[in-house]
């Protein structure tokens, strides 16, 4: 923590300018008025402060705004944003996309994924929902950041906005996030023709239920292996060998390469070996001929 001293008269600060780079940490602490700093934040980023000096400026702002900075200050943080922790950012109320853009630009090239995720979260809360303008900003300035949002935040995305999401924006999304996004995509794209629909829905299919995957198998979509491997294990397990063959089309040969990886491995274990043999791929591990399969989950549900 910076020790308190009184400011020498000749060092009194009346405006934020380049002369401050020659101030020692304790001089900055003693001589810079926090209210003046806040009022002239737009000048700070143009001044080549050291990281130590930025620490002092942050400390001044923290004292002035213990409940969180106002957006007029946040908008002009510039490189001072690099000093912010997720805990700091959680106190903010951000509604302007210009503020978001400015801070996303500053964070580029720095290890700030937690801070950026928290910032985006605050923007979504501040704006009330994840609207099209916010999604457009994220996809333009922070590819992959959409997936930093919690499923609860993603639930505020209107289906009409889903069309603005690109496949690469979903690369880092986990199953719980895709569970939220997939039904929105399904609603958003439902008026498209079969082939166009599949192209659009494909990046979201990690959130699809079995019945939707089965329906796709009837539509000659020739799903690629990468998409198949991202399907939920629970969505894949009930598929028959015939359904998987129809779903993958010419890509069915890729099952051999993925034989030891989930969900393919788990799916193989649930198929009759005779059925797997019809694929001619040499897949092993299926249920031997003559064995009886009991589906206990359905029996329990009936009891």
């Amino acid at each position: 923590d910076v020790e308190r001293t009184t400011c020498p008269p000749e060092k009194e600060v009346h405006e934020i300018d380049e002369s401050l780079i020659f101030y020692k940490k304790r001089e900055l602490e003693a001589c810079v008025d926090a209210a003046l700093l806040a009022a002239q934040m737009d000048r700070v980023d143009a001044i080549p402060f050291t990281y130590e000096q930025l620490d002092v400026l942050k400390h001044k702002l923290d004292e002035l705004y213990p409940q969180g900075y106002p957006e007029s200050v946040i908008r002009h943080l510039g490189h001072l944003f690099l000093k912010m922790s997720p805990e700091d950012i959680r106190k903010w109320n951000v509604t302007s996309l210009e503020t978001l853009k400015a801070l996303l630009k500053v964070s580029k090239g720095h290890e700030m994924s937690a801070q950026v995720a928290t910032l985006i979260d605050r923007v979504v809360v501040g704006r009330g929902q994840l609207d099209k303008d916010t999604v457009d900003t994220l996809t333009a300035f922070c590819p992959g950041c959409l997936c930093s949002l919690s499923p609860e935040r993603l639930s505020s995305v209107p289906p009409s906005v889903i069309g603005a999401v690109r496949p690469q924006d979903l690369d880092t999304c986990g199953p719980r996030q895709l569970d939220v996004l997939y039904p929105k995509a399904r609603l958003a794209f439902q008026n498209m023709s079969g082939s166009e629909y599949f192209v659009k829905i494909r990046p979201f299919l990690g959130g699809a239920p079995t019945e939707d995957v089965k329906a796709l198998s009837q539509q000659n979509v020739s799903m690629d292996l990468a998409t198949f491997m991202k399907l939920r294990r629970e969505a894949v397990l009930p598929l028959t060998v015939a359904e998987v063959q129809k779903l993958l089309g010419p890509h069915v040969e890729g099952l051999k390469v993925e034989e030891q990886h989930s969900p393919v491995r788990d799916w193989i274990l649930k198929q009759r070996q005779d059925d797997l043999d019809t694929l001619g791929l040499g897949l092993q591990g299926g249920i031997p001929n003559g064995y009886l399969i009991l589906d206990l989950s359905v029996r329990e549900a009936l009891s």
Epitope: V180, D212, A301
Partner: antibody, heavy 122, light 107 residues
């Protein structure tokens, strides 16, 4: 043959929480989206919300602040909790299956429970 | 939210005759419309989806038409079991919304 059965108390006091459960028998809860729909006596239908087996939900904005929909895959059940009820929440509550086929890509219901009447009264 | 309006509220038709029920959406729902039949004390039953596709097991006398904001359910030759309440439902956007229903009664 998949069947749905609603269960829960038929009488709830004002300001309390209405709790209902829908049991899915004859098939797995994992394969579809599952909804709650209600119908006040002599009136039309109102969609309350849906749940996916993973726990992902979506509900009607008019009820969102009072609605919790949850799922228990081990029991093949999903549940509805509606808090701070008033007489206006008196209705027959149905659980229903969303048809879930991309071939017809829609959010409509091909299978319904028989419904259970919940009366809100002191 | 999309408001669905059905007309008439009650329709009186003789058995064997044709019944035409209307449903209007407050904004376009494309062809994302379903029709249900509900009899007293029973749950609704899906008749039509996609505005015009009959659900499994629904007799050919039931037909749906329309797109955008105007939709029609037609029952070509009324049977005694067809007298019930009919609801339309849009699924073009959330929240899913239903019409207030048309009661089809025997004349």
């Amino acid at each position: 043959q998949v069947q749905l059965q609603e269960s829960g108390p038929g009488l709830v006091k004002p300001s309390e929480t209405l709790s209902l459960t829908c049991t899915v028998s004859g098939g797995s809860i994992n394969n579809y989206y599952w909804s709650w729909v209600r119908q006040p006596p002599g009136k039309g239908l109102e969609w309350i919300g849906y749940i996916f087996y993973s726990g992902s939900t979506n509900s009607n904005p008019s009820l969102k602040s009072r609605v919790i929909i949850s799922v228990d895959t081990s029991k093949n059940q999903f549940s509805l909790k509606l808090s701070s009820v008033t007489a206006a929440d008196t209705a027959v509550y149905y659980c229903a299956r969303e048809v879930g086929r991309i071939a017809v890509a829609g959010w409509f219901f091909d299978l319904w429970g028989r419904g259970t009447l919940v009366t809100v009264s002191s | 939210e999309i408001v669905m309006t059905q007309s008439p509220a009650t329709l009186s038709v003789s058995p064997g005759e044709r019944a035409t029920l209307s449903c209007r959406a407050s904004q376009s729902v494309n062809s994302n419309l379903a029709w249900y039949q509900q009899k007293p004390g029973q749950a609704p039953r899906l008749l039509i989806y996609g505005a015009s596709t009959r659900a499994t097991g629904i007799p050919a006398r039931f037909s749906g038409s329309g797109s955008g904001t105007e939709f029609t359910l037609t029952i070509s030759s009324l049977q005694s079991e067809d007298f019930a309440v009919y609801y339309c439902q849009q699924y073009n956007n959330w929240p899913l919304t239903f019409g207030q229903g048309t009661r089809l009664e025997i004349k």
